[in-house]
Interface confidence: low
C-alpha cells in the first residue's frame, strides 16, 4: 500500500479501480456509485449490486463515489458580484463566474469577487483583461502606474517609487497624497 494515505484511500486501494472495500467485510469489493448518485446501501456480497440512489434536487456528485450523501450545490455569491454561468445538476456543481468586462479577484482558493476590468485611462492596454487577471496598463508620459491606474506625475512625491518615471516633473511637485477623498 502507498504510505500516508487516509483510511478510506487505504481501503479503496485494496480493490480494483471502480470498486471499494465493504466497510464491514474487507473480503468484499463493491462497485462504486456513478456520478449523480450516492451510496444508499453497500453491496450485500461479491458480484452483487451496490444500492445507489440519484441525488436529490439541490445536491450533486461529480464523480464515481461511495458517499453516504450527495454534496450540496454551491450558491453564487451575489454580494461578490458573481453570476451563475450554469445551474447545478445531479452530476455537476453550480458554475459561478463574472459578467463581461469583469475579472475574478481571488481572496482565497475558493472565494473570488468580480471587479470591472481597468480601462487604462491616461495609458494604453499592455495585456488585455483575462478571466483571473485585470488589464495590465502602460501609462502615457507624465503619468505613473500605481495600483493599476495611471496617476499624474503631479501626485508623485520624492519618497515614492515613481520618482524615476516622473524625474523631469518631480522637482516642482508638492506633497498632495494625504488629501485624497472619494
Amino acid at each position: 500500500l502507498v504510505p500516508h494515505l487516509g483510511d478510506r484511500e487505504k481501503r479503496d486501494s485494496v480493490c480494483p479501480q471502480g470498486k471499494y472495500i465493504h466497510p464491514q467485510n474487507n473480503s468484499i469489493c463493491c462497485t462504486k456509485c456513478h456520478k449523480g448518485t450516492y451510496l444508499y446501501n453497500d453491496c450485500p456480497g461479491p458480484g452483487q449490486d451496490t444500492d445507489c440512489r440519484e441525488c436529490e434536487s439541490g445536491s450533486f456528485t461529480a464523480s464515481e463515489n461511495h458517499l453516504r450523501h450527495c454534496l450540496s450545490c454551491s450558491k453564487c455569491r451575489k454580494e461578490m458580484g458573481q453570476v451563475e454561468i450554469s445551474s447545478c445538476t445531479v452530476d455537476r456543481d453550480t458554475v459561478c463566474g463574472c459578467r463581461k468586462n469583469q475579472y475574478r479577484h481571488y481572496w482565497s482558493e475558493n472565494l473570488f469577487q468580480c471587479f470591472n476590468c481597468s480601462l487604462c485611462l491616461n495609458g494604453t492596454v499592455h495585456l488585455s483583461c483575462q478571466e483571473k487577471q485585470n488589464t495590465v496598463c502602460t501609462c502615457h508620459a507624465g503619468f505613473f502606474l500605481r495600483e493599476n491606474e495611471c496617476v499624474s506625475c503631479s501626485n508623485c512625491k520624492k519618497s515614492l517609487e515613481c520618482t524615476k518615471l516622473c524625474l523631469p516633473q518631480i522637482e516642482n511637485v508638492k506633497g498632495t497624497e494625504d488629501s485624497g477623498t472619494t
Epitope: E79, M80, H105, W107, S108, Q113, F115, R146, E147, N148, E149, S159, L160, E177, D178, G180
Partner: nanobody, 119 residues
Framework: EVQLLESGGGLVQPGGSLRLSCAAS????????MGWVRQAPGKGLEWVSQ????????YYAHSVKGRFTISRDNSKNTLYLQMNSLRAEDTAVYYC????????????WGQGTLVTVSS
C-alpha cells in the same frame, strides 16, 4: 474564508475619542489596501478612510480629515482607526474594508462596530 472582525465601538460624548480595531484573517493582509466605511442610521454607506498596503499612503474623507487617523500593523494583521474630536454626525456602524486598488470597490464582512456620539 476572508474574515474582518471590527471592535472598539461604544458610546462617547461629543469631543471624545475612540480607537477602532479590525482583526483580519483568511487573506494575505500585507498585500492589500485597507480602509473604513460607515453607515449612519437610515443612510447609505460612506467612505471614511483608506491606507495603502505598506502604510505609506493614507486617504481621508473631508468630513473626518484632521480628526481621524488610520494606521495598520501588518505583523498583527490589524487595522486601526483613531477617532478624536468626535461629533454627533460621526454616529454610525463602522465597517472594515479591503481594497484591491485605490478606486476599486470595497468588500466588507462581519457585523461592524457601532459608534454612538451623544451627550
Amino acid at each position: 474564508e476572508v474574515q474582518l472582525l471590527e471592535s472598539g465601538g461604544g458610546l462617547v460624548q461629543p469631543g471624545g475619542s475612540l480607537r477602532l480595531s479590525c482583526a483580519a484573517s483568511g487573506f494575505t493582509f500585507v498585500k492589500y489596501s485597507m480602509g473604513w466605511v460607515r453607515q449612519a442610521p437610515g443612510k447609505g454607506l460612506e467612505w471614511v478612510s483608506q491606507i495603502s498596503n505598506t502604510a505609506d499612503r493614507t486617504y481621508y474623507a473631508h468630513s473626518v480629515k484632521g480628526r481621524f487617523t488610520i494606521s495598520r500593523d501588518n505583523s498583527k494583521n490589524t487595522l486601526y482607526l483613531q477617532m478624536n474630536s468626535l461629533r454627533a454626525e460621526d454616529t454610525a456602524v463602522y465597517y472594515c474594508a479591503v481594497y484591491t486598488g485605490r478606486w476599486e470597490p470595497f468588500v466588507y464582512w462581519g457585523q461592524g462596530t457601532l459608534v454612538t456620539v451623544s451627550s
